[in-house]
Amino acid sequence: SERCDDWGLDTMRQIQVFEDEPARIKCPLFEHFLKFNYSTAHSAGLTLIWYWTRQDRDLEEPINFRLPENRISKEKDVLWFRPTLLNDTGNYTCMLRNTTYCSKVAFPLEVVQKDSCFNSPMKLPVHKLYIEYGIQRITCPNVDGYFPSSVKPTITWYMGCYKIQNFNNVIPEGMNLSFLIALISNNGNYTCVVTYPENGRTFHLTRTLTVKVVGSPKNAVPPVIHSPNDHVVYEKEPGEELLIPCTVYFSFLMDSRNEVWWTIDGKKPDDITIDVTINESISHSRTEDETRTQILSIKKVTSEDLKRSYVCHARSAKGEVAKAAKVKQKVPAPRYTVELACGFGAT
């Protein structure tokens, strides 16, 4: 066969679907690789061909579109499973071609089993809710295109294993789940089960997502430098090790980049001719506020080093702050010569 532009196996789009549920999978060529859509390609006389490689096999084979009840079908640039089976797992390829043009891409599809409490190896999307922020909603994800707008599905929401009804601050509202006032106790996995009829059959779509309650923007502040501070003086003798921790608290801020850095005499530590090492550790609170600690260390400090200014800087979307460490050379204690005068007393 003639040459085909092969985009390889697109592992970025690791598609996971539940067993015994409908799945609609769009050919990734039009979404991520080509500059035109399916309609344009179709009008230009290009044909979309699907085939697959079963799990643990090397042989590419055509997809059987003649299964009972049209279990697998293709519609435009979508491959449909109504429903999936466990052994549908494999690498799927969509190829767009005519006599002069060819382009193809493969992607992995994994059919996943779930237990009665919706536990599974499925990678779950995370939805962040602000703590005590007023009404916030999550929406049952990835259900568009499964049924026409004329069909009114039934939607049941679960938290973990439990059906959500008569919960204090969580109210199911069709495709949405409303949190009246999100609290830490609302952290967990939430599942919507969408049930709809199609051609005399009933299908279920199960979608689970993780809700994580995070710090509210109402409470967000610029970074707070806890150390260095005015109360601690780093008093060292030449030759000793100088260790200065910079500890910074960052409020949780959606999509904010938290940065901490040291300067020595205003410069990047790498640009100074001293042997400096900086080690960083990061910890998070339950609401994803972050504490970063960067420890600056100079193994054998010189008297020149003790005259420099060591400043810790921090920045987030809320602002920038800086704090200088109080570093000084230890004044050696004076050495007293004690003279003992011995008096001989005559009696």
Epitope: G266, K268, E320, K323
Partner: antibody, heavy 118, light 112 residues
Framework: SVEESGGRLVTPGTPLTLTCTVS????????MIWVRQAPGEGLEYIGF?????RAYCASWAKGRFTISRTSTTVDLKMTSLTTEDTATYFC????????????????WGQGTLVTVSS | AQVLTQTASPVSAAVGGTVTINCQSS????????LAWYQQKPGQPPKLLIW???SLASGVPSRFKGSGSGTQFALTISDLESDDAATYYC????????????FGGGTEVVVK
């Protein structure tokens, strides 16, 4: 080093672009500030550009002055110049590596003189 | 816009003496400490002395001391030398946005 250029005698209303050429450091590491000084007067802040490339201008300069940069130059574009804009224009580098604000600047050019006169 | 008000000019003192220049901000500077002090002599660009309210810039003698926080700052020059005769400026950065940086009006120091 930092060096300003582009200052000259112009008539009111004329646009003018001043260029600050830097060497020995990266503009991705340091913020740059523009400051001016009218004859016999104090220093006046015009605006700055942060290491990330975002530029800010003083409220009085907004709309008339814009700051932009390339990899080795920082430009100050001025429009609708008036006699009040007569000054020596300085460009300076922030003293502090990677800081947003160049309020503390250690590397200054000698300045370029802009005279607006009819 | 933010305003930095400095001690009125001129301030004079004898060689070997001490001078203090105050700088008051109409609003707290960023982080309460984003304030710098400069020295400027005629025909020269400013020279950075102090940054972060009290940190000495490289190569600046320890006779220059910055202090203060929030809205009130001071520059103290001790053991005055004739070479210290110059105009001194404070400069602040404000967190509201970049358009709100400012210089003080300057204070001339005369050394007798």
């Amino acid at each position: 080093s930092v060096e300003e250029s582009g200052g000259r005698l112009v008539t009111p209303g004329t646009p003018l672009t001043l260029t600050c050429t830097v060497s020995g450091f990266s503009l991705n590491d340091y913020a740059m500030i523009w400051v001016r000084q009218a004859p016999g007067e104090g220093l006046e802040y015009i605006g700055f550009i942060e290491p990330g490339g975002r530029a800010y201008c003083a409220s009085w300069a907004k709309g008339r002055f814009t700051i932009s940069r390339t990899s080795t130059t920082v430009d100050l574009k001025m429009t609708s110049l008036t006699t009040e804009d007569t000054a020596t224009y300085f460009c300076a580098r922030s003293y502090v590596f990677y800081s947003t604000y160049p309020y503390a600047s250690d590397l200054w050019g000698q300045g370029t003189l802009v005279t607006v006169s009819s | 816009a933010q305003v930095l008000t400095q001690t009125a000019s001129p301030v004079s003192a004898a060689v070997g003496g001490t001078v203090t220049i105050n700088c008051q901000s109409s609003q707290s500077v960023n982080g309460n400490n984003y304030l710098a002090w400069y020295q400027q002599k005629p025909g020269q660009p400013p020279k950075l002395l102090i940054w972060l309210a009290s940190s000495l810039a490289s190569g600046v003698p320890s006779r220059f001391k910055g202090s203060g926080s929030g809205t009130q700052f001071a520059l103290t020059i001790s053991d005055l030398e004739s070479d210290d005769a110059a105009t001194y400026y404070c400069a602040g950065a404000y967190s509201t946005s970049g358009e709100e940086n400012a210089f003080g009006g300057g204070t001339e120091v005369v050394v007798k």
